[in-house]
């Protein structure tokens, strides 16, 4: 439950267009115990690759690239009646505004695949 | 290339820790034709729960959890020779800071959840 | 090579206990966490417990907490399950397996997942 329960809600109409933000990142448990390999391990394997932009925060985005169309099967050999597809994201970034070295931003939601999945061709049914 | 070159990236030591920023979001149409299907398509299939908090900017954020410990077969059965994980993504988000009703976020790292993968065991070479 | 052998399962009535061991070969505890998990005929396979050596952290499911408490003995490569209070629903296939992640907040299927290895399995029926 809010802390502030009269507050508005930043995504309610009448909340301020601006507001300020501390750039000091409070790190929530973000547990980075687990298991980086996954994209090798998968069934559907992925490549990482960096996406940078110095008007952009945060500047550096890892995005994730299926290696096959098909799925990797149990000899390592890639099955085609399954289709390797990138699982993806929205995202909020913040934006520099284009003023020459303004401390404004603004957020800006961005499409990310984060990493590939297997799944099972559908087949839509054509009249 | 970076509209302003000179300029302090926004991740370096000595750029300003407070920033104005517009919550007018940039790029609303992120492409949402992406098929959302994925979840019970995979093979390593996942339920999607609502995590909701009004604190923070965005409010409502979709986690995937796994349906499975192993990954599910061309029958349809589960294959507990193969691992069902959870691929995640830290991601940014705003977080009021906890003076009443201020207009003041700070920004937090968050993991999450965005869908599942299917991999195969990895047995670490013990010593 | 890893391997895990689990013993103990036997049939007992509703209402008493059981201990189940898991002696673990080719690993030690400092190199994997731990899972109990069960399968009842025709279900799915389910966490039951993790255990973590590294900080003697334990995780139940709710359909057990308060009843099943997981321990180890470091020195026999063993961990344990003790099962009180048994229900016939508690009726399944019992495996304990080395997994490779154990977080609480994880969104897999069960705390502990990512399994390297699992056992054999031994089996525990609850007669009413």
């Known amino acids: 439950s809010p802390q502030n329960p009269g507050c508005p809600n930043a995504e309610d109409k009448n909340f301020p267009r601006t507001v300020m933000v501390n750039l000091n990142i409070r790190n929530r448990n973000t547990n980075s115990k687990r298991a980086s390999d996954y994209y090798n391990r998968s069934s559907s394997p992925w490549n990482l690759h960096r996406n940078e932009d110095p008007e952009r925060y945060p500047s550096v985005i890892w995005e994730a690239k299926c290696r096959h169309l098909g799925c990797v099967d149990a000899d390592g050999n890639v099955d085609y009646h399954m289709n390797s597809v990138p699982i993806q994201q929205e995202i909020l970034v913040l934006r520099r505004e284009p003023r020459h070295c303004t401390n404004s931003f603004r957020l800006e939601k961005m499409l990310v695949s984060v990493g590939c999945t297997c799944v099972t061709p559908i087949v839509r049914h054509v009249a | 290339s970076p509209q302003n070159p000179g300029c302090p990236n926004a991740e370096d030591k000595n750029f300003p820790r407070t920033v104005m920023v517009n919550l007018n979001i940039r790029n609303r149409n992120t492409n949402s034709k992406r098929a959302s299907d994925y979840y019970n398509r995979s093979s390593s299939p996942w339920n999607l729960h609502r995590n909701e908090d009004p604190e923070r900017y965005p409010s409502v954020i979709w986690e995937a959890k796994c349906r499975h410990l192993g990954c599910v077969d061309a029958d349809g059965n589960v294959d507990y020779h193969m691992n069902s994980v959870p691929i995640q993504q830290e991601i940014l988000v705003l977080r009021r800071e906890p003076r009443h009703c201020t207009n003041s976020f700070r920004l937090e790292k968050m993991l999450v959840s965005v869908g599942c993968t299917c991999v195969t065991p990895i047995v670490r070479h013990v010593a | 090579e890893v391997q895990l052998v689990e013993s103990g399962g036997g049939l007992v009535q509703a209402g008493g206990s059981l201990r189940l061991s898991c002696a673990a070969s080719?690993?030690?505890?400092?190199?994997?966490?731990i899972g109990w998990f069960r399968q009842a005929p025709g279900k799915e396979r389910e966490g039951v417990s993790c255990?973590?050596?590294?900080?003697?952290?334990?995780f139940y499911a709710d359909s057990v907490k308060g009843r099943f408490t997981v321990s180890a003995d470091n020195a026999k490569n063993t961990v344990y399950l003790q099962m009180n209070s048994l229900e016939p629903e508690d009726t399944a296939v019992y495996f304990c397996?080395?997994?490779?992640?154990?977080?609480?907040?994880?969104?897999?299927?069960?705390?502990?997942?990512?399994?390297?290895?699992w056992g054999q399995g031994t089996q525990v029926t609850v007669s009413s």
């Open positions: 255990f973590t050596s590294s900080d003697g952290r334990t």
């Open positions: 080719g690993f030690t505890f400092d190199d994997y966490d």
């Open positions: 397996a080395a997994v490779n992640t154990f977080d609480e907040s994880a969104y897999a299927a069960f705390a502990c997942y990512d399994v390297v290895r």
